[in-house]
């Protein structure tokens, strides 16, 4: 029967009429000619997290699509011989008579393939989240374990403190917190975890032994040690935390003082014309994610803006600049400034007392999240996210967000480089105004406010548990400046990377190991990406990310200040202009010199190299206290460890809910550090069954010191 | 329901004539078909004998089959016939008529014999 | 016309047992080849066009190959239903030169 048509076969036929050979149905167009080529298609799993049945679906999907292009393919041809004047057989007339249907069939495949792909990558997505977010969680439950190590090395060390072994003893109320054999076990087990240097073992196997002893510790173990278990211990130990101890009134306390907190601010509408009020969030409990958050907008891609709107800056907004400006001192030297014509005119307010009850005014109107970032939380050696910030949301696995860091201001920096380890002393402050980064021109420099270094201080009365204020920007808007030219671009912050899109509000009332460092929180949620081009947006941001300050158009002098009272201690290191990527933008700015944070390694304190490079019997030069004029009591001294997990406990700063008073450093402007002067109430020695000199060094070993002038 | 029903079998003697219709339905005989008569003698194998394009009306046959049948068809009528001349006794067998090469009738005996 | 030799015109094997039969044409027929299963008093039913494309329905146990002049047939393994007799046809056709629909002889398959 005429089943065959014309032959591309080597056959001597000729061209001779089709065969008649009738195929049916579909079968009829998989087979003849050659095949069409198969379409290429995405690798159907892209790794390991791909679940198996996926990829078998899409294996089908993949399989049945190659047979359909090949059939498609096929039908061309014989359509085309067709039109040729050729003739088909039957098999192939019946193909040519399903084109539609294999056309079509091809289209759903195609389609049911992308859908099962988007599906595919959905799962991946998915578990990806899954996976970081359980990393993130045991990061968090490993940072909670430093944590509590951390206060309980410093509860030890405070233990070889006659007058705190006494005030233990005596108790709170004249109830005992410790017992004398308690102390005594403590002391038996701080020689476990502190243990003298024993030459005949390596450092490491050494520390290793304490860890042991720490971990089994902190597991609360039935496991017997000195005359003890862990567990006794673990108890012990918990109940120092709970005894609000270190929390009472011989130590001072960081927060803003009563009459602060009570003061409002002066209104500054007629400077932000077009700004709408918004009122300042109340004060809401910590664990609360913030509801209005400052987005640095030059941090997200230009393309992803497609708003043509005038950005706004809310009023309260700007005030906010003003006080983080405020915080932030940069030195004179700084190569001179020309003022760019701004909306808003900084103007050197005349009386600095005047100046420091403004900003502390503002600071105790702000009540809403304001969320401080520490530095050590900006540590990301190993690419790994801020555990503090897990509880808010798993940032999604595709968007690596970089975390900037606030600059210091430059000083000495031609050594800088050579010896980034050296703690230069700030010769004078002047005030580093942020450039906020909207549109239209827009730059915030507000009003510098120059608290001059009273030497009366406040006293303080029940603190405010956190300083927060929200800074609103709203994130729908365009951007039309990014950041700077290399040239022009003085400052920026050093991003970080991997961090979460959300972040709830750290407690500036820190632990002193984890000096306080404002930083906008670029956290904040951006504008949602396509959920089928987050994969391809691996590389979108860039690696680090530039922030612009423009230097102080108005020299401001500041005779007041004294060498002594300027001890802060800042590491900061002048990075090269090249060292960040910048982003091209019509944002003009000064020429500055370009001060930069790199990553440090020491996560865990205050991330600044501060005490870094110093001899160890040198950690009492970190321990003193300063003078009654700033009120600052240095040390561990101002803090209560909690060592229970709180529900904030995720927080590594918000465990110390007493504050500590930095606030001669916060309101003149300076990034208080961790230090420890030279006045540590006294070494441990004898009561500690110690024998032998009594070890200067009582604290971490691993800090190292250095030196301030 | 597609099917092809074949008719017109029946014994002749040699030397004579015979028409076989083969009558199709469930499909039209304006598509893109091949028509085509099979033949298989009792205990032997399938033997082409023509077909016919239904598009076009064109035809082939087997050699043997030249000159003495005739392929024809009826678009009005979804009837496709087999005219059998000068019979032989050879000739006898189960004539099946096909659509392509997968739809059959169930064939209709011819027998030649005097 | 065109001529195809199928062989072996009988075979015996067992349950399980692969089975091939062979189709030759007497000149090129490309891939246009037919294999049909007919059992007794039953038109054929078509197994394979195109010289290896399964018709819908068909056990995947059924397999063709070839092209040009030499093509096979093959059961992979041999089932009680397979007894029939299974026969190759050129489904070419040309307009100049009628190829013609030629059968093979066919090929009697049995269970030892």
């Known amino acids: 029967m005429p089943s065959a048509t014309s032959h591309s076969g080597s056959g001597s036929k000729s061209s001779g009429p089709p065969p008649p050979s009738g195929s049916s149905g579909s079968e009829a167009a998989a087979g003849a000619g050659a095949a069409a080529p198969a379409s290429q298609h995405p690798a159907t799993g892209t790794g390991a997290v791909q679940t198996e049945a996926m990829k078998q679906i899409l294996g089908v999907i993949d399989k049945k699509l190659r047979n359909l292009e090949k059939k498609k393919g096929k039908l061309d041809d014989y359509q085309e011989r067709m039109n040729k004047g050729e003739r088909l057989n039957q098999d192939q007339l019946d193909a040519v008579s399903k084109y539609q249907e294999v056309t079509n069939n091809l289209e759903f495949a195609k389609e049911l393939q992308r859908s099962f792909m988007a599906l595919s990558q959905d799962i991946q997505k998915t578990i990806k989240k899954t996976a970081r977010r359980e990393q993130l969680m045991r990061e968090e439950a490993e940072q909670k374990r430093l944590k509590t190590v951390l206060e309980l090395q410093y509860v030890l060390d405070k233990l070889g403190d006659d007058e705190v072994r006494t005030d233990l003893k005596q108790g709170l109320n004249g109830v005992p917190i410790l017992s004398e054999e308690e102390l005594s076990l403590l002391d038996e087990f701080y020689k476990l975890v502190d243990p003298e240097r024993d030459m005949s073992l390596r450092l490491n196997e050494q520390y290793e032994h304490a860890s042991i002893h720490l971990w089994d510790l902190l597991e609360g173990k039935e496991k017997p040690v000195c005359g003890t278990t862990y567990k006794v211990l673990k108890e012990i130990v918990e109940r120092v935390f709970q005894s609000n101890y270190f929390d009472s009134t011989h130590n001072h306390q960081n927060g803003l003082c009563e009459e602060e907190e009570a003061a409002s601010a002066p209104a500054v509408e007629d400077q932000v014309p077009e700004a709408e009020p918004e009122p300042a969030e109340e004060y809401t409990e910590q664990s609360e994610v913030e509801s209005t958050e400052y987005v640095n907008r030059q941090f997200m891609a230009e393309t992803q803006f497609t708003s043509g709107e005038k950005e706004q800056v809310d009023e309260w907004t700007v005030e906010t600049v003003e006080v983080v400006n405020s915080l932030q001192q940069q030195p004179q030297a700084a190569s001179p400034s020309v003022p760019e014509p701004h909306s808003l005119t900084p103007v050197a307010q005349a009386d600095p007392l005047v100046r420091r009850q403004r900003v502390q005014d503002l600071m105790a109107q702000m009540q809403g999240p304001y969320n401080f970032i520490q530095d050590s939380m900006l540590d990301f050696e190993n690419q790994t996210l801020d555990p503090a910030i897990v509880s808010a949301q798993p940032m999604n696995p595709t968007q690596n967000m970089d975390m900037p860091q606030l600059v210091c201001p430059p000083v000495h920096s031609e050594s800088r480089l050579a010896q980034p380890n050296q703690v230069p002393v700030q010769p004078e402050a002047t005030q580093v105004p942020l450039v906020s980064s909207t549109s239209e021109g827009y730059t915030a420099s507000q009003p510098l406010y120059q608290p001059s270094h009273a030497t009366e201080q406040r006293p303080q009365k029940e603190p405010i548990d956190q300083i927060q204020a929200t800074i609103s920007l709203n994130t729908d808007q365009t951007t039309a400046s990014s950041s700077l030219p290399a040239a022009s671009q003085p400052q920026v912050f050093q991003a970080g990377t991997s961090k979460p899109l959300h972040s709830s509000g750290i407690n500036v009332n820190a632990a002193p190991f984890q000096s306080m460092q404002t930083v906008f929180n670029m956290n904040a949620p951006v504008p949602p990406v396509n959920e089928p081009e987050t994969l391809k947006q691996q590389n979108q941001y860039q690696a680090s990310y530039n922030q612009s300050f423009s230097s102080q158009p108005h020299q401001v002098e500041q005779t007041e200040l004294q060498q002594e009272q300027l001890q802060t201690v800042v590491g900061t290191y002048h990075g090269s202009p090249d060292q960040s990527h910048q982003v091209t933008g019509n944002h003009q700015q000064p020429p500055q010199q370009n001060t930069g944070f790199p990553r440090s390694n020491q996560p865990y304190y205050n991330s600044r190299g501060v005490s870094r490079g110093g001899s160890r019997g040198a950690r009492g030069l970190m321990n003193g206290y300063r003078g009654p004029a700033n009120g600052f009591r240095g040390g561990y001294d101002g803090y209560r460890p909690s060592f229970s997990n709180t529900p904030n406990s995720g927080y590594t700063q918000s465990q110390f809910s007493a504050p500590r008073d930095y606030s001669g450093y916060q309101r003149d402007g300076y990034q208080q550090n961790f230090k420890r002067g030279s006045g540590q109430s006294g070494p441990r020695g004898a009561p500690r069954g110690r024998g032998g000199p009594p070890r200067p060094n009582r604290g971490m070993p691993q800090m190292n010191t250095q030196q301030v002038n | 329901q597609v099917q092809l029903v074949e008719s017109g079998g029946g014994l002749v003697k040699p030397g004579g004539s015979l028409r076989l219709s083969c009558a199709a339905s469930?499909?039209?005989?304006?598509?893109?078909?091949?028509m085509s008569w099979v033949r298989q003698a009792p205990g032997k194998g399938l033997e082409w004998i023509a077909y016919?394009?239904?598009?076009?009306?064109?035809?082939a046959y087997a050699n043997w089959a030249k000159g003495r049948f005739t392929i024809s068809r009826d678009n009005a009528k979804n009837s496709l016939y087999l005219q059998m001349n000068s019979l032989r006794a050879e000739d006898t067998a189960v004539y099946f008529c096909?659509?392509?090469?997968?739809?059959w009738g169930q064939g209709t005996l011819v027998t030649v014999s005097s | 016309d065109i001529q195809m030799t199928q062989s072996p015109s009988s075979l015996s094997a067992a349950v399980g047992d692969r089975v091939t039969i062979k189709c030759q044409a007497s000149?090129?027929?490309?891939?246009?080849l037919a294999w049909y299963q007919q059992k007794p008093g039953k038109p054929p039913k078509r197994l394979i066009y195109?010289?290896?494309n399964l018709d819908s329905g068909v056990p995947s146990r059924f397999s063709g190959s070839g092209s040009g002049t030499d093509f096979t047939f093959t059961i992979s393994s041999l089932q009680p239903e397979d007894i029939a007799t299974y026969y190759c046809?050129?489904?070419?056709?040309?307009?100049?030169?009628?190829?013609?629909?030629?059968f093979g002889g066919g090929t009697k398959v049995e269970i030892k």
């Open positions: 096909a659509r392509g090469n997968r739809l």
């Open positions: 469930g499909f039209s005989f304006s598509g893109s078909y091949y």
């Open positions: 016919i394009y239904i598009g076009d009306g064109v035809t």
């Open positions: 000149q090129s027929i490309s891939s246009y």
């Open positions: 195109d010289a290896s």
């Open positions: 046809q050129c489904t070419a056709v040309s307009s100049a030169t009628i190829y013609g629909n030629a």
